[in-house]
Interface confidence: medium
């Protein structure tokens, strides 16, 4: 199947930032795409492709854009109001409880188990016991057969905040 791409691949390349624009806070908050000045009097725009803010805020700095790693595809670029969207490449996945890196999906199920779920960018293949139908979790002691059509790419660390 086709390769998966990261959010950076989906979004445009980072642009040169225009001069920062200023406006006044509303009830002490600045709109998405801005942060508040140190004296609290101005809202300063985030720099396109460099940082962003998604909500009304009183941040002194905009949040730094994520940069997708080599093992990821960029789905969409970082704008002043939205962070980069990155996704693990085909054959690798990132679990919510270990978001720091894309890990290789298993290529098959252990003996006595059958595959019921595919490798996706957010989950490993899913295996269940042939008889009981219960899910398998943990390390795979032995692989009965290869069940995916492509081995994927090596896992690589995936930074979430720049």
């Amino acid at each position: 199947e086709s390769a998966l791409i990261t959010q950076q691949d989906l979004a445009p390349q980072q642009r040169a930032a225009p001069q920062q624009k200023r406006s006044s806070p509303s009830e002490g908050l600045c709109p998405p795409g801005h942060h508040i000045s140190e004296d609290g009097r101005d809202c300063i725009s985030c720099k396109y492709g460099q940082d962003y803010s998604t909500h009304w805020n009183d941040l002194l700095f905009c949040l730094r854009c994520t940069r997708c790693d080599s093992g990821e595809v960029e789905l969409s670029p970082c704008t002043t109001t939205r962070n980069t969207v990155c996704q693990c490449e085909e054959g690798t996945f990132r679990e919510e409880d270990s978001p720091e890196m894309c890990r290789k999906c298993r290529t098959g199920c252990p003996r006595g188990m059958v595959k019921v779920g595919d490798c996706t960018p957010w989950s490993d293949i899913e295996c269940v016991h042939k008889e009981s139908g219960t899910k398998h979790s943990g390390e795979v002691p032995a692989v009965e057969e290869t069940v995916t059509s492509s081995p994927g790419t090596p896992a690589s660390p995936c930074s979430l905040s720049g």
């Epitope: 791409i5 950076q8 691949d9 445009p12 960029e74 789905l75 969409s76 670029p77 969207v85 960018p121």
Partner: antibody, heavy 124, light 107 residues
Framework: GVQLVESGGGLVQPGGSLRLSCAAS????????MSWVRQAPGKGLEWVAN????????YYVDSVKGRFTISRDNAKNSLYLQMNSLRAEDTAVYYC?????????????????WGRGTTVTVSS | SELTQDPAVSVALGQTVRITCQGD??????ASWYQQKPGQAPVLVIY???NRPSGIPDRFSGSSSGNTASLTITGAQAEDEADYYC???????????FGGGTKLTVL
Amino acid sequence: GVQLVESGGGLVQPGGSLRLSCAASGFTFSSYWMSWVRQAPGKGLEWVANIKQDGSEKYYVDSVKGRFTISRDNAKNSLYLQMNSLRAEDTAVYYCARDLLKVKGSSSGWFDPWGRGTTVTVSS
Amino acid sequence: SELTQDPAVSVALGQTVRITCQGDSLRSYYASWYQQKPGQAPVLVIYGKNNRPSGIPDRFSGSSSGNTASLTITGAQAEDEADYYCNSRDSSGNHVVFGGGTKLTVL
């Protein structure tokens, strides 16, 4: 290999209906957003509609809203386009296209592969 | 939301040509590029920042800046003569839009 094959096109009178089908093979159909794209004779490509992996989200170009319905049957690895109240301007080759990537949220908008297309002619 | 392409571009055999695509949505979403020859279905040649599907020659490359995406063919070949279309998600992120297409002639 990965393949998409459209069917169901033909000649229909204005106001009539057609149902297009797209048979998918060689990949896990239920993992991908799917789209219909059309091309009028001598014209460019126009995205028509797309549908999320589980069918829970569907989007349409404004010109077909309320007349066309996209649907899918993951058990049959099939995509459909029900076209009602057809107009002369709906005359086109209709392509079935798969999203290049498995994505959880919105469609990437990057299409690969494409089917060979099925021709719809709306004429009296 | 619209994407705008030049209707026609020509290039001498072996020379470099750039085909451009403009639209507001390209500030938020990457384009992809398709090659279509007469009587055939479109073929994806570039997607995202600058990614080529397997089987696409490395003379094809992509880039983007501001509201413009570009497809560059370095050392154009006779077989590159075709219509080229860009597309991306529209500004809402849910719909998809195509450019009007560029007819490339290799002289």
